[in-house]
Interface confidence: medium
């Protein structure tokens, strides 16, 4: 359905508040360094223009595409060249190249300060202007997460304001706010990572990769839905994600609302779990659908082997419509196995496809593919064994100790990767233990494998910006579904030339004594990475000795009366003993 004015159409569909929020998110994701007030000004200008177009669709400029309107606003920013450098060159291009250019300049790791929640200050700001407070949240999250799923960010901003509505009345604001903000922060970070993986899937592997992922996920959630229902939703959902990943946030939010309506209109055919979602307002409804629990697997489903191994017509069915046949295999496998990770289901489908490619070219295809399900078994056993082994390690050493084991493991695999990235990734990997190892057996695999996919995607995104390791590039680019097994298979990189010893990472001052525990851990873990970069073949015993010396040194100096004096005098001794221990 074509509209004379796209901007008027979206303004009418979304309403003024959501329109403004989405425009603010879009600008903040493109211009990540601009101050909030600058963005507010741009949003106001575009909102006024949209209202003009609502009143008169044939007003000058109202027929322009949203990319043209957005891009023109971005290119008006006076400090574009000095703040963003060659991003300003995008403004010399025409659409659609101009928007592509802006997208390519999104920074996944912008140098922005860590946000520290100060309850009294935040409550004062909230009470002074709730709308501005809501906008500031959108802005701060969007600029730090330039691929955040925009309509979902609107949902979180509303939730965030709700928390302040409740807690700023409380006697102890901090006690009420901080745990809620922390819990929300975790959810927001996970949401950001999920969307980043979706966008990377589309950008690096094409929309077929995202469609396959969505087929598996939705088949697990809606196992009683038929294949055509699942593929219809997957097609619409892929369009929504393509739009959001491409910066078309107004279309994305609008289409997401339509999809939520479709799902609720057809909930009887999809899942008994949707009832609780479908009475909610649109943003909450969409969020609820995305998070909905898996419905029970229907009883009496025939065994998979009937259609996909025993049937003599498998090759005929496959060759007539490869994507549909493989899609139905993925659907049928996924709906029967809610206890499998999506990434594992995708590996099963990939290997099944490879088997058919091989077998269907043979004299007796049936004899060849009849045993395919035996061949697939190792794809389920491998992650199960890995999870068992790593959860045992986690249970033995706790989160911090497990993180340190992962730091050793991953620094040896990819010592060329920057130290902050290795620390960040290993810390995240270590948190998988806390998040997943306590879960029941039926949830352990989806929890670990799918969470690992998010973390390894973060590594791939950061590494792509400054590629330093051929092994990492290979694991990141060869196969989306096999990324985790690829990283698991990496061993010590023998091509790596060790770094000279860098004293800087063993230069400590009295400020370490007052750091929060997390930051203290990061300092120690940074030192551990640097040790390994200097001596990748250091034994676990040597590393243990050095780290124990280091902890003793910090403890001793932090207990001293003259803390800094202690660091000044004992620091060089630590450096010397470290070098001696590694000699």
């Amino acid at each position: 359905d074509t509209h004379k004015s796209e901007i008027a159409h979206r303004f009418n569909d979304l309403g003024e508040e959501n329109f403004q929020g989405l425009v603010l998110i879009a600008f903040s994701q493109y211009l990540q360094q601009c101050p909030f007030d600058e963005h507010v000004k741009l949003v106001k200008e575009l909102t006024e223009f949209a209202k003009t177009c609502v009143a008169d669709e044939s007003h000058a400029g109202c027929d322009k595409s949203l990319h043209t309107l957005f891009g023109d606003e971005l290119c008006k920013v006076a400090t574009l060249r000095e703040t963003y450098g060659d991003m300003a060159d995008c403004c010399e291009k025409q659409e659609p190249e101009r928007n592509e250019c802006f997208l390519n300049h999104k920074d996944d790791s912008p140098d922005l300060p860590k946000l520290k929640p100060e309850p009294d200050t935040l409550c004062a700001e909230f009470k002074a202007d709730e709308k501005k407070f809501w906008g500031k949240y959108l802005y701060e999250v969007a600029r730090r997460h330039p691929y955040f799923y925009a309509p979902e960010l609107l949902y979180y901003a509303n939730k965030y304001n709700g928390v302040f509505q409740e807690c700023c009345q409380a006697e102890d604001k901090g006690a009420c706010l901080l745990p809620k903000i922390d819990a929300m922060r975790e959810k927001v970070l996970a949401s950001s990572a999920r969307q980043r993986l979706r966008c990377a899937s589309i950008q690096k592997f094409g929309e077929r990769a995202l469609k396959a992922w969505s087929v598996a996920r939705l088949s697990q959630k809606f196992p009683k839905a038929d294949f055509t229902d699942v593929t219809k939703i997957v097609t619409d959902l892929t369009k929504v994600h393509k739009e959001c990943c491409h910066g078309d946030l107004l279309e994305c939010a609008d289409d997401r609302a339509d999809l939520a309506k479709y799902i609720c209109d057809h909930q009887d055919a999809l899942s008994s779990k949707l009832k609780e979602c479908c009475d909610k307002p649109v943003l909450e409804k969409s969020h609820c659908i995305a998070e909905v629990d898996k419905d029970a697997v229907p009883e009496n489903l025939p065994p998979l082997t009937a259609d996909f191994a025993e049937d003599k017509e498998v090759c005929k069915n496959y060759q007539e419509a490869k994507d549909v046949f493989l899609g139905s295999f993925l659907y049928e496998y996924s709906r029967r196995h809610p206890e499998y990770a999506v990434s594992v289901l995708l590996r099963l489908a990939k290997e099944y496809e490879a088997t058919l490619e091989d077998c269907c070219a043979k004299e007796d295809p049936h004899a060849c593919y009849a045993t395919v399900f035996d061949k697939l078994k190792h794809l389920v056993d491998e992650p199960q064994n890995l999870i068992k082994k790593n959860c045992e390690l986690f249970e033995k050493h706790g989160e911090y100790g497990f993180q340190n084991a992962l730091i050793v493991r991953y620094t040896r695999k990819a010592p060329q990767v920057s130290t902050p990235t290795l620390v960040e990734i290993s810390r995240s990997l270590g948190k998988v233990g806390t998040k997943c190892c306590a879960k029941p057996e039926s949830e352990r695999m989806p929890c670990t494998e799918d969470y690992l996919s998010l973390i390894l995607n973060r590594l791939c995104v950061l590494h792509e910006k400054t590629p330093v390791s051929e092994k990492v590039t290979k694991c990141c680019t060869e196969s989306l579904v096999n990324r985790r097994p690829c990283f698991s298979d990496l061993t010590l990189d023998e091509t790596y030339v060790p770094k000279p010893f860098d004293e800087k990472f063993f230069t400590f001052h009295a400020d370490i004594c007052t750091l929060p525990d997390t930051e203290k851990q990061i300092k120690k873990q940074t030192a551990l990475v640097e040790l390994l970069k200097h001596k990748p073949k250091a034994t676990d015993e040597q590393l243990k000795t050095v780290m124990e010396n280091f902890v003793a040194f910090v403890d001793k100096c932090c207990a001293a009366d003259d803390k800094e004096g202690c660091f000044v005098l004992e620091g060089p001794k630590l450096v010397a003993s470290t070098q001696a221990a590694l000699a």
């Epitope: 010893f501 004293e503 800087k504 063993f506 230069t507 001052h509 009295a510 400020d511 000044v568 620091g571 060089p572 001794k573 450096v575 010397a576 070098q579």
Partner: nanobody
């Protein structure tokens, strides 16, 4: 090769002020923490102040806290020590040093600048 060149010392009356400078070369100054140490006549080395590579945080020995201020200009590869309310016991040769060293002594430091506080 690492070079550290201190300047700004001299004779000053008690209660007076001096500003010491240390020009650095031969290493990446902006990634190195730096410190001032001093040696009074017939005494051992005493650390005075440390500054982080970014300029903050800074640290001071109790004996100079509130009177001395350490600072740096990374664009000029220069370290400073502003000394106010000087006392006779501040008399010493002042050295700037790269912190820490790989051995149990400060192996990168300059030739020093003498500060004499006397009436």
């Amino acid at each position: 090769e690492v070079q550290l060149l201190e300047s700004g010392g001299g004779l000053v009356q008690p209660g007076g002020s001096l500003r010491l400078s240390c020009a650095a070369s031969g290493f990446t100054f902006d990634t190195s923490s730096m410190l001032w140490v001093r040696q009074a006549p017939g005494k051992g080395l005493e650390w005075v102040s440390v500054i982080h590579q970014s300029g903050t945080p800074t640290y001071y020995a109790d004996s100079v806290k509130g009177r001395f201020t350490i600072s740096r200009d990374n664009s000029k590869n220069t370290l400073y020590l502003q000394m106010n309310s000087l006392r006779a016991e501040d008399t010493a040769v002042y050295y700037c040093a790269k912190f820490p060293s790989s051995r149990m002594k400060f192996d990168y430091w300059g030739q020093g600048t003498l500060v004499t506080v006397s009436s």
